[in-house]
Amino acid sequence: LQDPCSNCPAGTFCDNNRNQICSPCPPNSFSSAGGQRTCDICRQCKGVFRTRKECSSTSNAECDCTPGFHCLGAGCSMCEQDCKQGQELTKKGCKDCCFGTFNDQKRGICRPWTNCSLDGKSVLVNGTKERDVVCGPSPADLSPGASSVTPPAPAREPGHSPQ
């Protein structure tokens, strides 16, 4: 015999109190699959969490974090403080990128500057903690008589020592 509840679609629940009629989920609840005997309470995005997607009768609300924080965990269960550009989040908190590395995001890790010479190119613009180097044309690409751009010595940024 087929379970009458299996006919209840997402957004409803099989109401045992009403002869297993499919009843709509009450306000602030949802069922994401058919055949459910109860609806789940909608997640509320409060405090440091803000609503990214409202709850509907068939899907839970989705949260993200307020500015200055980013999500951790399945479904954004926690918020972690953003670092600044030019930093990375380490086990000891936000740390400046080491010399020769950069991070142009407020999360993620510091990555090494591009090595222009590997592509036979020269450094057009020096890298910083926040930006990668910009590689210029290879010396061979330059027209005769044009002055080539030579990679400058990696001058340390003021007050920024290698870690």
Partner: antibody, heavy 116, light 107 residues
Framework: QVQLQQSGAELVRPGASVTLSCKAS????????MHWIKQTPVHGLGWIGA????????DYNQKFKDKALLTADKSSNTAYMELRSLTSEDSAVYYC?????????WGTGTTVTVSS | DIQMTQTTSSLSASLGDRVTISCRAS??????LNWYQQKPDGTVKLLIY???RLHSGVPSRFSGSGSGTDYSLTISNLEQEDIATYFC?????????FGGGTKLEIR
């Protein structure tokens, strides 16, 4: 830096009520939920509930639904917890703590002693 | 409610030891596990959040690991200032729940 300063120890009579305070500093008070935790030697740490200072919305542990009332005053950056109809079971240390999905900053704790 | 169990209520170790404290959840908590340190004066501090992320200012001798229902906190080189009680706590579901605590003492 972020700090939560709680009110001083309380000695109260059985049946009375008491209101504990938790003053926040060093961050935007309305931007984070404030949670309250009870600690006793026998039962350890127990979650009482939480308040969103921005909206005044609350969540309670069913065990404390009739015991605790959480409020917050954005103008003074202070969260409050009223404990009602006190009995010796309510003698404990109570902590407020800021929530990020984890409790990153804790208050100093308030000791409540219920005794006649 | 999700039950959090710390089977060892007290632990005795020597300075310099590697100490591991375990915590078990009654259901899968998907790494939503945090560790706190409570000093004898009652001060509580966050050590580790989301199973393994070290809170800012916490010494790197502290580390966390685990998944599903089983989690642990490790102190790699025990120092005098680590004498405290350590609690795990889940953030998977309300109500938030804590382990019973593990009191760490010097042998």
């Amino acid at each position: 830096q972020v700090q939560l300063q709680q009110s001083g120890a309380e000695l109260v009579r059985p049946g009375a009520s008491v209101t504990l305070s938790c003053k926040a500093s060093g961050y935007t008070f309305a931007g984070f939920e404030m949670h309250w935790i009870k600690q006793t030697p026998v039962h350890g740490l127990g979650w009482i509930g939480a308040i969103d200072p921005k909206t005044g919305g609350t969540d309670y542990n069913q065990k404390f639904k009739d015991k605790a009332l959480l409020t917050a005053d954005k103008s003074s950056n202070t969260a409050y917890m009223e404990l009602r109809s006190l009995t010796s079971e309510d003698s404990a240390v109570y902590y407020c703590t800021r929530d990020l999905g984890y409790f990153d900053v804790w208050g100093t704790g308030t000791t409540v002693t219920v005794s006649s | 409610d999700i039950q959090m169990t710390q089977t060892t209520s007290s632990l005795s170790a020597s300075l310099g030891d590697r100490v591991t404290i375990s915590c078990r959840a009654s259901q899968d908590i998907r790494s939503n596990l945090n560790w706190y340190q409570q000093k004898p004066d009652g001060t509580v501090k966050l050590l580790i959040y989301y199973t393994s992320r070290l809170h800012s200012g916490v010494p790197s001798r502290f580390s966390g690991s685990g998944s599903g229902t089983d989690y642990s906190l490790t102190i790699s080189n025990l120092e005098q200032e680590d004498i405290a009680t350590y609690f795990c706590q889940q953030s998977e579901k309300l109500p938030r729940t804590f382990g019973g605590g593990t009191k760490l003492e010097i042998r």
